[in-house]
C-alpha cells in the first residue's frame, strides 16, 4: 500500500503537496519577524517569542503546542561593571583598553539589550601577566609550544585565534597548560574572505566585530547543575564547585582591531612556521611577553560576568500520527540567539516555522502523518544545548522507546555554494533519494536535481558519483538525541565552498552584525537556498513520518563500520612493536563488522520480501530498523564522558564540533607514545576494541531473524 492509503487520506496529500506548500516568501517574512530584537536565552524577549511561536503553531493547525520550562545555569555580563582587557604599564596604569561593545550596525543604533561580547560561563577575575600567543589553542598547538618550543604557559595569559575547533576545547587546553586567562580573537585569516567587503557593505567581519559563545566542556551533560536529570521545580542542584564543565580561568573575546594592539607588541619566540601566522600586520611572535620597549608592560583582564539559574522555555508542538502515534519523528531547532540571530538560529527557525505551516495546511485538509511528528523550538542552545538536553532528560524513557528520528534545524545557511549534510548512515539513502527529487537552486544547474549540483560541488571522497555526507559531531541540539539516546539523527544546511574559503564558519557568526539584512542583501536575496533547505529538512521529516517501511538502510552502516575499522586499525598500526608486545588484535572487531555486514544484507533481503499488509510484521521490521541506532549505545558511556554513549560516533575529545569514529579506541590510542605506563595504556586500547567489537556484534544480532 502507499503511505496515503495507510493513513486513509486522499492521494493528493503526498510529499509533493507538502513540498509545494513551502514558500520562500514566507520564510523571508518569518526571518524578518524573528530578527528585529535580540532573543537572548533567559530574557523576557525570548519568552515572548516562545509564546508567539506557540500561538502561531496552534494557528497553523498542530494538535497541541506546549511550553516546557526549566531552570538552568546561564551566564551574563555585569551591566554596571563591564568586561574588558587592558595593557598596563609598570605602574599598573591602564594604557590601552579593549572595546566594551561592538559598534552597532546601521539601523540598530537605538536597539536596547544588545549583550556585549563575552565568553559565557567565564569565571570572574582580574588576572594580569605576560601574553603567550597559542595559535588556535588546539591540542597540537600546545604540543608544539610545550614539547618542541619548550614554552611554558603556566601563569601566563594566552591569546588564541578563533577557528578550527570549538572554543570550549581551546579553553580546556589552556587550563591544562596552566594558563591563568584566555583571550579569544577573530583573525581575518579565518573570518575575512578576500575580495569581500566588511559589514554593512559585505558579509565580512569588521575590525570591531566579536564572536560571542559559551566556553563550557559539558560533554553532553546539559544544565551544569543537574547532569542526567531535568532542571525542574524539584531538582536537586549541585553546588557551583561541583557543576559540570565550567571553566576555571577568566576568558574574554575581542575583535581584530583590539587583537592587533595586543599582538603587535609581542616578543619572545618567533612563530614556529607559517601556519601560526594570520593576516594581521603583526609578527605573530609567541612570547612570552612583549618586545623590548614594551617588556615592562603586562596584560590585565577584567571579567565580572555572573552565573545565574534562569528559567528557559522550549516550545513543543505535536502533530499526532494516524497509524503509529507512539512513534515520534522530531524536527527541532533553537530559538535563542546571541543578538539578532540573522543566521544563527533564525534562518533555521524561519524554515521550521514554514515546515510547520505546510504540515498544518495538509492537516487542516484532513491529512495526518502515519507517525507522530514533534516540532521543537529549543531555548538556551547557545549556553550549552540546554533546552533540548533538559527536555530529552525529562522525556528520555519515552524517547528511547518511541524515537524514530531527529532532524536538526539550526542555521539554514552558512554560505550559498552547495548543500551540506551530516547524518547517521541509516539516512544516507533517504537523503540521496530525496535530493534526486528536488530541484537545485544553484546557478548553472537550472533544471537539474539538487543531488546533481551537490555531488558536483561536494563529491564524496570515497564513492564517485555520490555527494559527501559527514559524520555527526556536536555543538548542536541533535547531541542528546544521537550521542546519548541513540536516536537516528541528521542535519542539513547550505554551506560555503570549503576549498576556496578557508575561514572558520561564516565571518559574522555570533556577532551583532548577524542581521536580517546580512541574509537578505548578501547570502540569499531570493531565499531560494532557504527554500531548498526547507525542502530537504521537511522532506526528510515527511518520509520518516509517513513511509510505511522506515527509510533506513542498515547496509550503509555496514559499509561505514568497515571503513572506520580500517581507519582505527591503521592508526594503531603506527605502533607495530607495541601491538606485538601487548598482543593487541583487531580480529574481534573485524569479525563483528563482517557479521554485521552479512546480517544487514540478509535483513535487507527480508525487508524487500515481507508482507507489508501484515501490521504486526511491519511493526516488527520497523522496530528493528528504529532500534538499530539504539543498539550502538553503551549504557556505561565513554571513559570520563558518561553522556556520550554511542560507541560508533562521539564528538572529538579535541573538537566538540567534529565527529570521531570508534571514539573509545581513538582516544585510547591518542598520544599513546607519551603515556607514562605503556602497559596500562595498551591495556585500555584492548578494552576499547573489546567494547567496540561486542557492541557491533550485539547491534548485528538485533537485525537477525527474531526467532
Amino acid at each position: 500500500k502507499s503511505s496515503n492509503e495507510a493513513t486513509n487520506i486522499t492521494p493528493k496529500h503526498n510529499m509533493k503537496a507538502f513540498l509545494d506548500e513551502l514558500k520562500a516568501e514566507n520564510i523571508k517574512k518569518f526571518l524578518y519577524n524573528f530578527t528585529q530584537i535580540p532573543h537572548l536565552a533567559g530574557t523576557e524577549q525570548n519568552f515572548q517569542l516562545a509564546k508567539q511561536i506557540q500561538s502561531q503553531w496552534k494557528e497553523f493547525g498542530l494538535d497541541s503546542v506546549e511550553l516546557a520550562h526549566y531552570d538552568v545555569l546561564l551566564s551574563y555580563p555585569n551591566k554596571t561593571h563591564p568586561n574588558y582587557i587592558s595593557i598596563i604599564n609598570e605602574d599598573g596604569n591602564e594604557i590601552f583598553n579593549t572595546s566594551l561593545f561592538e559598534p552597532p550596525p546601521p539601523g540598530y543604533e537605538n536597539v536596547s539589550d544588545i549583550v556585549p561580547p563575552f565568553s559565557a560561563f567565564s569565571p570572574q577575575g582580574m588576572p594580569e601577566g605576560d601574553l603567550v600567543y597559542v595559535n588556535y589553542a588546539r591540542t597540537e598547538d600546545f604540543f608544539k609550544l610545550e614539547r618542541d618550543m619548550k614554552i611554558n604557559c603556566s601563569g601566563k595569559i594566552v591569546i588564541a585565534r578563533y577557528g578550527k575547533v570549538f572554543r570550549g576545547n581551546k579553553v580546556k587546553n589552556a587550563q591544562l597548560a596552566g594558563a591563568k586567562g584566555v583571550i579569544l580573537y577573530s583573525d581575518p585569516a579565518d573570518y575575512f574572505a578576500p575580495g569581500v567587503k566588511s559589514y554593512p557593505d559585505g558579509w565580512n567581519l569588521p575590525g570591531g566585530g566579536v564572536q560571542r559563545g559559551n566556553i563550557l566542556n559539558l560533554n553532553g551533560a546539559g544544565d551544569p547543575l543537574t547532569p542526567g536529570y531535568p532542571a525542574n521545580e524539584y531538582a536537586y542542584r549541585r553546588g557551583i564547585a561541583e557543576a559540570v564543565g565550567l571553566p576555571s580561568i577568566p576568558v574574554h573575546p575581542i575583535g581584530y582591531y583590539d587583537a592587533q594592539k595586543l599582538l603587535e607588541k609581542m616578543g619572545g619566540s618567533a612563530p614556529p612556521d607559517s601556519s601560526w601566522r594570520g593576516s594581521l600586520k603583526v609578527p605573530y611572535n609567541v612570547g612570552p611577553g612583549f618586545t623590548g620597549n614594551f617588556s615592562t608592560q603586562k596584560v590585565k583582564m577584567h571579567i565580572h560576568s555572573t552565573n545565574e539559574v534562569t528559567r528557559i522555555y522550549n516550545v513543543i508542538g505535536t502533530l499526532r500520527g494516524a497509524v503509529e502515534p507512539d512513534r515520534y519523528v522530531i524536527l527541532g531547532g533553537h530559538r535563542d540567539s546571541w543578538v539578532f540571530g540573522g543566521i544563527d538560529p533564525q534562518s533555521g527557525a524561519a524554515v521550521v516555522h514554514e515546515i510547520v505551516r505546510s504540515f498544518g495546511t495538509l492537516k487542516k485538509e484532513g491529512w495526518r502523518p502515519r507517525r507522530t511528528i514533534l516540532f521543537a523550538s529549543w531555548d538556551a542552545e547557545e549556553f550549552g544545548l540546554l533546552g533540548s538536553t533538559e527536555w530529552a532528560e525529562e522525556n528520555s524513557r519515552l524517547l528511547q522507546e518511541r524515537g524514530v528520528a531527529y532532524i536538526n534545524a539550526d542555521s539554514s545557511i552558512e554560505g550559498n555554494y552547495t548543500l551540506r549534510v551530516d547524518c547517521t548512515p541509516l539516512m544516507y539513502s533517504l537523503v540521496h533519494n530525496l535530493t534526486k527529487e528536488l530541484k537545485s537552486p544553484d546557478e548553472g544547474f537550472e533544471g537539474k536535481s539538487l543531488y546533481e549540483s551537490w555531488t558536483k560541488k561536494s563529491p564524496s571522497p570515497e564513492f564517485s558519483g555520490m555527494p559527501r555526507i559527514s559524520k555527526l559531531g556536536s555543538g548542536n541540539d541533535f547531541e542528546v538525541f544521537f550521542q546519548r539516546l541513540g536516536i537516528a539523527s541528521g542535519r542539513a544546511r547550505y554551506t560555503k565552498n570549503w576549498e576556496t574559503n578557508k575561514f572558520s564558519g561564516y565571518p559574522l557568526y555570533h556577532s551583532v552584525y548577524e542581521t536580517y539584512e546580512l541574509v537578505e542583501k548578501f547570502y540569499d536575496p531570493m531565499f531560494k537556498y532557504h527554500l531548498t533547505v526547507a525542502q530537504v529538512r521537511g522532506g526528510m521529516v515527511f518520509e520518516l513520518a509517513n513511509s510505511i517501511v522506515l527509510p533506513f538502510d542498515c547496509r550503509d552502516y555496514a559499509v561505514v563500520l568497515r571503513k572506520y575499522a580500517d581507519k582505527i586499525y591503521s592508526i594503531s598500526m603506527k605502533h607495530p612493536q607495541e601491538m606485538k608486545t601487548y598482543s593487541v588484535s583487531f580480529d574481534s572487531l573485524f569479525s563483528a563488522v563482517k557479521n554485521f555486514t552479512e546480517i544487514a544484507s540478509k535483513f535487507s533481503e527480508r525487508l524487500q520480501d515481507f508482507d507489508k499488509s501484515n501490521p504486526i510484521v511491519l511493526r516488527m521490521m520497523n522496530d528493528q530498523l528504529m532500534f538499530l541506532e539504539r543498539a550502538f549505545i553503551d549504557p556505561l558511556g565513554l571513559p570520563d564522558r558518561p553522556f556520550y554513549r554511542h560507541v560508533i560516533y562521539a564528538p572529538s575529545s579535541h573538537n566538540k564540533y567534529a565527529g570521531e569514529s570508534f571514539p573509545g579506541i581513538y582516544d585510547a590510542l591518542f598520544d599513546i607514545e607519551s603515556k607514562v605506563d605503556p602497559s596500562k595504556a595498551w591495556g585500555e586500547v584492548k578494552r576499547q576494541i573489546y567494547v567496540a567489537a561486542f557492541t557491533v556484534q550485539a547491534a548485528a544480532e538485533t537485525l537477525s531473524e527474531v526467532a
Partner: antibody
Amino acid sequence: QVQLVQSGAEVKKPGASVKLSCKASGYTFTYFDINWVRQTPEQGLEWMGGISPGDGNTNYNENFKGRVTMTRDTSKSTAYMELSRLRSDDTAVYYCARDGNFPYYAMDSWGQGTTVTVSS
Amino acid sequence: DVVMTQSPLSLPVTLGEPASISCRSSQSLVYSNGNTYLHWYQQKPGQSPRLLIYKVSNRFSGVPDRFSGSGSGTDFTLKISRVEAEDVGVYFCSQSTHVPYTFGQGTKLEIK
C-alpha cells in the same frame, strides 16, 4: 563618513616650535593609528611618524627624532604633532593620515593639509 | 631606509590610451605574514593624496576599475587601461612593510 580636519596655516621663525592638530570624525578614533606626512617640492612625501590613539604609543622616523612629539586627546578625537627647532627646510605642507588597519595597512584617509612656513 | 624609485617621473599620455608607472624598492616588501604592503596614491592638483591601490593589487573603494596594480617582491607596476582627463595628477608608490614608511618621488601624469 571618515574625516580628518587639520588646523590652519602657520608662519614660524627658525628655532621656534609649531603644534598642529588633526580632528577625526566618522569612526572610532582609538582603533586607527594617525600618521603625519609632510610634502616639500625637494623631498616629496616624507613619513614623520605615527601615534596609536588607543595607548598613545608613538613611532617616529629617525630623521625627526628629538624634534617631533606626537600626542592625542581621545576625549576630543584629536591628534597633535609638534615640531621643534624649526628650520627653513621644514617649510612644507603637513598632512595627518589615518592608518587604515586591516585589510589596508595603508593611509586610507588624509587631512586637507596644513601649510607651515618657516621664515625669518 | 627602504628607497622607492619610480619611473618615469613624467608621463605624457593621450586621452583613452593606456599608461604604466613602475616602482622599484631597494629591498623586498614581503612582510612575515606573506602580505606585501605596497600601495599607490593619487594626488590631484591642489588636493591631498588619496589611496588608490593597497597591497599591490587591491583597488580601494570608489576607485575606477581602469586602475590596476601588479608586481611582487621589489618590482611593482600601476596601470591605467584608458586614461581620462580626471586622472591628471601625481602618482606615488609607498611601502608600509618596513619602518620608516617611505614614498617614491612621484610620477606626474599629464595629457598630451
